[in-house]
């Protein structure tokens, strides 16, 4: 019997300092460019090697960005979201949602050392 794939969703506040080449990541999404089905949210599509986000290490490709400097990213056109990042200033606070894939074991399976039974 196959295991079930679940997702562990966590939120994190990430404070980035704009580096010499900017924040160092790309985004997809928006009300006019849905990248995830039935979700117009803004997602990280690429992290630039040695950019500010990469050097910080917490932001990951696939993360959903919920807000920038406290401004909600819901219901934004794609380009409006891009402009928000580009004009966000030197110190940028991101509220992000990480979605971690969790592989559960097969149903009915008990691992070694399971105290029950």
């Amino acid at each position: 019997m196959n295991g079930r794939v679940d997702y562990l969703v966590t939120e994190e506040e990430i404070n980035l300092t704009r580096g010499p080449s900017g924040l160092g990541f790309n985004i997809v999404g928006g009300t006019d460019q849905q990248y995830v089905s039935n979700d117009s949210g803004i997602y990280v599509s690429r992290i630039k090697e040695n950019g500010a986000a990469a050097l910080d290490g917490r932001l990951q490709e696939g993360d959903k960005i919920l807000s920038v400097n406290g401004q909600d990213l819901k219901n934004l056109l794609h380009q409006d979201a891009v402009d928000l990042f580009r004009n966000a200033g030197y110190a940028v606070s991101l509220r992000v949602q990480h979605r971690l894939q969790v592989q559960n074991g097969p149903i009915g399976h008990r691992g070694e050392g399971d105290p029950s039974g």
């Epitope: 010499p20 080449s21 900017g22 924040l23 160092g24 990541f25 790309n26 985004i27 997809v28 006019d32 460019q33 990248y35 990280v44 599509s45 690429r46 630039k48 090697e49 040695n50 794609h78 380009q79 891009v82 990042f85 580009r86």
Partner: nanobody, 127 residues
Framework: DVQLVESGGGLVQAGGSLRLSCAAS????????MGWFHQAPGKEREFVAE????????GYTDSVKGRFTISRDNAKNTVYLQMNSLKPEDTAVYYC?????????????????????WGQGTQVTVS
């Protein structure tokens, strides 16, 4: 992934025009930011122009502003670079490039590190 093939290069006299094309194969073309770079002999590859996935936003390096125009046709999976008032210093190999999503940094910072997919290049010579 996306594959890119440039065309339209050639030999042109100073003051003349050329239109470069870049045909892309692959899915979700409108999710890709597209750019043009050029590389002169003995020099590094340099940013020329960029266009967002929907075509609503463009950026240019200072030396081509007012002379070059980047555009795209998402129905044809193609990006174009219209080059007018060409100068001898525009002589280079021109490369089409693509990256998924939109950079959150302005084109003032753009470099080849910002792009993941590249064409084979097309030679432009201005005499």
């Amino acid at each position: 992934d996306v594959q890119l093939v440039e065309s339209g290069g050639g030999l042109v006299q100073a003051g003349g025009s050329l239109r470069l094309s870049c045909a892309a194969s692959g899915r979700a073309f409108s999710s890709y930011t597209m750019g043009w770079f050029h590389q002169a002999p003995g020099k590094e590859r340099e940013f020329v122009a960029e266009i967002s996935g929907t075509g609503g936003n463009t950026g240019y390096t200072d030396s081509v502003k007012g002379r070059f125009t980047i555009s795209r046709d998402n129905a044809k999976n193609t990006v174009y670079l219209q080059m007018n008032s060409l100068k001898p210093e525009d002589t280079a190999v021109y490369y089409c490039a693509a990256v998924i999503g939109s950079p959150t940094d302005s084109t003032d910072y753009r470099s080849s590190l910002d792009y993941d997919y590249w064409g084979q290049g097309t030679q432009v010579t201005v005499s």
